[in-house]
C-alpha cells in the first residue's frame, strides 16, 4: 500500500478579520494509526492550533466527524479571526506511540491572511490656537489594518491638500499596521468654518474610505479690528464715544475703557454679531461727561482677545472745541477680544 | 451541554478492587482521550493514565501502572477507572476529565480495614 | 517527566490586592500545552486558563496568564472574595501528564 500523504490543497487563504476560516486538510491513508494535530509555525516553536483528542480549542470546530469509520478529512474552521491568527498552518498526522505519540507527516501548509479593517481615523490639531497666515500641523492616525497597502489623503475644504508626509508602522511584516501622518496647513481670516479631513483607503473598505475631520474652529484664532470713533452730541455736556470691535474669534474678548489712562470701565462681550465667515463683531459705548474736563481727553478702547496681550485704539477728545463730531482716530489696528460693553 | 457524571462514593478494604465509571453527554465519548486524575485529602492532582475511547489505547503514569485499568464503553458513552490492591494511601477522591476543560464531580474512595 | 514546582506554596493576600503565582516547569513545556486551574474545596478543579494566556470561558478578565519554556506565572489582578482557592498549574506537553503542587490563596 502507498505511504500516507498529507494534502493540504490551499496554499494560501484570504479572510477578513471576524470572519471563520476554513483549512482544508485530507490523508490519502488511514494507516498509520494515530491522531491528526494543527500547528501554526514550524520547528520547535511551532503552536499548537488543534489537537483531534485532547486540550481546549474553544474556536476550532471539524467540518466532518474525525471519529467516523474510514473518515480522512482533517480539515477545521477556525472561528472569529483576528490579524493575530496570520501565519502558516500545518495539517500534521501523527503515529501512536510510546510513552509520545510521533510525528509522521506534515502537509505542505496553507498560509492564512488576514484583511483587517483600518480604525477610524483620528485627527487632531495644535494644542495652542494660530493666527491666520500662520502654519499648523494636524495629525491623522488609524490603526489595526492588515494587509500594510494603504492610502491616506488630506483635504481643506474639499481641496486636496499636497504638504504631508505619512508613515505606516511597522516597517517589517506583522500581524497588523498603523499609520500616522502630518499635514501643514496655513491658516486664512476665512477658515473658521473650515474644516480638515483625512481620509483613509484599504482593501477591506470596498471603496468607501473612512474619514476623520477637525474644524478649523478649534484651531484658529482671529485677532479683531479696532476703530474708535465720536459720535454726535447726545447732551450739552457730553459726547458718546464707540468702539468698534470688527472680525474676531473665538468670542472670548474683555474691552476696557480708560480715560486719560485710567480705567473708566471694564466689560465682556455678550451680545455679540456673527459674520458670515464666522467671525463675530461687537461695539461698546462710552459717555463722556466733557464738563468734568478742563483739559483735552485721551479715550483708549483697550480690548483683551482671547487671554492674548492687550491692543488697544485711542482718540482724542479736544474740552476746549464745542462737542461736535470729530473725526475717528487712525490709530494702528490691534488685535483684541470679543466682548459687549453698556454703560 | 458537555457534562461528565461519575458513580457514587465507595468504601473499600485494603487489597480490594474499585472500580468507578464516568458517563458523558454533550458529546460523543470517542471524540477526545478521557484522563482520570487521584486527589488524596489535602493534597495535589496526580494524573493516573488516560483512555483513548475510539480504539482502547491506554497510558498509565509509571506510579499506578499495573494497579490501574482504564476501560470504556463507547455503546453507553462511560469510561471506568479500576485500581486494584487497595491501601490506605488510595484514599482519594478521583475524577474523570476529558480535554482538560470538562471534569466529573469526583468519586471519593475510601480505603479501610 | 516534567516536574512542575509552584510557588509560593500558600500566599497571604487581603481582597484588592494583586496576586502573582509562579510554575516552573524541569524542562521547557511549549506554551501551547500548560493550562492552569482554580479549585475550592469540595468542588472539581476549573479550567481558568489555556495555552498559557488564553482565559477560559467565563473567567473574569482580572486573571491572566503569562510565560514561555520553563517559567509561567498567573496573575489576578486585584483579587475578589470568590478567588481565594487553590490554584494549579499543568501541562500535558509529554507523558506523564503533570500538575504543580499547587498555591493555596488565602485571605490575610
Known amino acids: 500500500e502507498e505511504e500516507l500523504q498529507v494534502i493540504q490543497p490551499d496554499k494560501s487563504v484570504l479572510v477578513a478579520a471576524g470572519e471563520t476560516a476554513t483549512l482544508r486538510c485530507t490523508a490519502t491513508s488511514l494507516i498509520p494509526v494515530g491522531p491528526i494535530q494543527w500547528f501554526r509555525g514550524a520547528g520547535p516553536g511551532r503552536e499548537l492550533i488543534y489537537n483531534q483528542k485532547e486540550g481546549h480549542f474553544p474556536r476550532v470546530t471539524t467540518v466532518s466527524d474525525l471519529t467516523k469509520r474510514n473518515n480522512m478529512d482533517f480539515s477545521i474552521r477556525i472561528g472569529n479571526i483576528t490579524p493575530a491568527d496570520a501565519g502558516t498552518y500545518y495539517c500534521v498526522k501523527f503515529r501512536k506511540g510510546s510513552p509520545d505519540d510521533v510525528e509522521f507527516k506534515s502537509g505542505a501548509g496553507t498560509e492564512l491572511s488576514v484583511r483587517a479593517k483600518p480604525s477610524a481615523p483620528v485627527v487632531s490639531g495644535p494644542a495652542a490656537r494660530a493666527t491666520p497666515q500662520h502654519t499648523v500641523s494636524f495629525t491623522c492616525e488609524s490603526h489595526g489594518f492588515s494587509p500594510r497597502d494603504i492610502t491616506l489623503k488630506w483635504f481643506k475644504n474639499g481641496n486636496e491638500l499636497s504638504d504631508f508626509q505619512t508613515n505606516v508602522d511597522p516597517v517589517g511584516e506583522s500581524v497588523s499596521y498603523s499609520i500616522h501622518s502630518t499635514a501643514k496647513v496655513v491658516l486664512t481670516r476665512e477658515d473658521v468654518h473650515s474644516q480638515v479631513i483625512c481620509e483613509v483607503a484599504h482593501v477591506t473598505l470596498q471603496g468607501d474610505p473612512l474619514r476623520g475631520t477637525a474644524n478649523l474652529s478649534e484651531t484658529i484664532r482671529v485677532p479683531p479690528t479696532l476703530e474708535v470713533t465720536q459720535q454726535p452730541v447726545r447732551a450739552e455736556n457730553q459726547v458718546n464715544v464707540t468702539c468698534q470691535v470688527r472680525k474676531f474669534y473665538p468670542q472670548r474678548l474683555q474691552l476696557t475703557w480708560l480715560e486719560n489712562g485710567n480705567v473708566s470701565r471694564t466689560e465682556t462681550a455678550s451680545t455679540v454679531t456673527e459674520n458670515k465667515d464666522g467671525t463675530y463683531n461687537w461695539m461698546s459705548w462710552l459717555l463722556v461727561n466733557v464738563s468734568a474736563h478742563r483739559d483735552d481727553v485721551k479715550l483708549t478702547c483697550q480690548v483683551e482677545h482671547d487671554g492674548q496681550p492687550a491692543v488697544s485704539k485711542s482718540h482724542d477728545l479736544k474740552v476746549s472745541a464745542h462737542p461736535k463730531e470729530q473725526g475717528s482716530n487712525t490709530a494702528a489696528e490691534n488685535t483684541g477680544s470679543n466682548e459687549r460693553n453698556i454703560y | 451541554e458537555v457534562q461528565l457524571v461519575q458513580s457514587g462514593a465507595e468504601v473499600k478494604k485494603p487489597g480490594a478492587t474499585v472500580k468507578i465509571s464516568c458517563k458523558v453527554s454533550?458529546?460523543?465519548?470517542?471524540?477526545?482521550?478521557m484522563h482520570w486524575v487521584q486527589q488524596a485529602p489535602g493534597k495535589g492532582l496526580e494524573w493516573m493514565g488516560r483512555i483513548d475511547p475510539e480504539d482502547g489505547e491506554t497510558k498509565y503514569a509509571p506510579k499506578f501502572q499495573g494497579r490501574v485499568t482504564i476501560t470504556a464503553d463507547t455503546s453507553t458513552d462511560t469510561a471506568y477507572m479500576e485500581l486494584s490492591s487497595l491501601r490506605s494511601e488510595d484514599t482519594a477522591v478521583y475524577y474523570c476529565?476529558?480535554?482538560?476543560?470538562?471534569w466529573g464531580q469526583g468519586t471519593t474512595v475510601t480505603v479501610s480495614s | 517527566e516534567i516536574v512542575l514546582t509552584q510557588s509560593p506554596a500558600t500566599l497571604s493576600l487581603s481582597p484588592g490586592e494583586r496576586a502573582t503565582l509562579s510554575c516552573s516547569a524541569s524542562s521547557s513545556v511549549s506554551s501551547s500545552y500548560l493550562y492552569w486551574y482554580q479549585q475550592k474545596p469540595g468542588q472539581a478543579p476549573r479550567l481558568l486558563i489555556y495555552?498559557?494566556?488564553n482565559l477560559a470561558s467565563g473567567i473574569p478578565a482580572r486573571f491572566s496568564g503569562s510565560g514561555s519554556g520553563t517559567d509561567f506565572t498567573l496573575t489576578i489582578s486585584s483579587l475578589e472574595p470568590e478567588d481565594f482557592a487553590v490554584y494549579y498549574c499543568h501541562q500535558w506537553s509529554s507523558y506523564p501528564r503533570t500538575f504543580g503542587g499547587g498555591t493555596k490563596v488565602e485571605i490575610k
Open positions: 476529565a476529558t480535554s482538560w476543560a470538562y
Open positions: 454533550g458529546f460523543n465519548i470517542k471524540d477526545y482521550y
Open positions: 495555552s498559557t494566556s
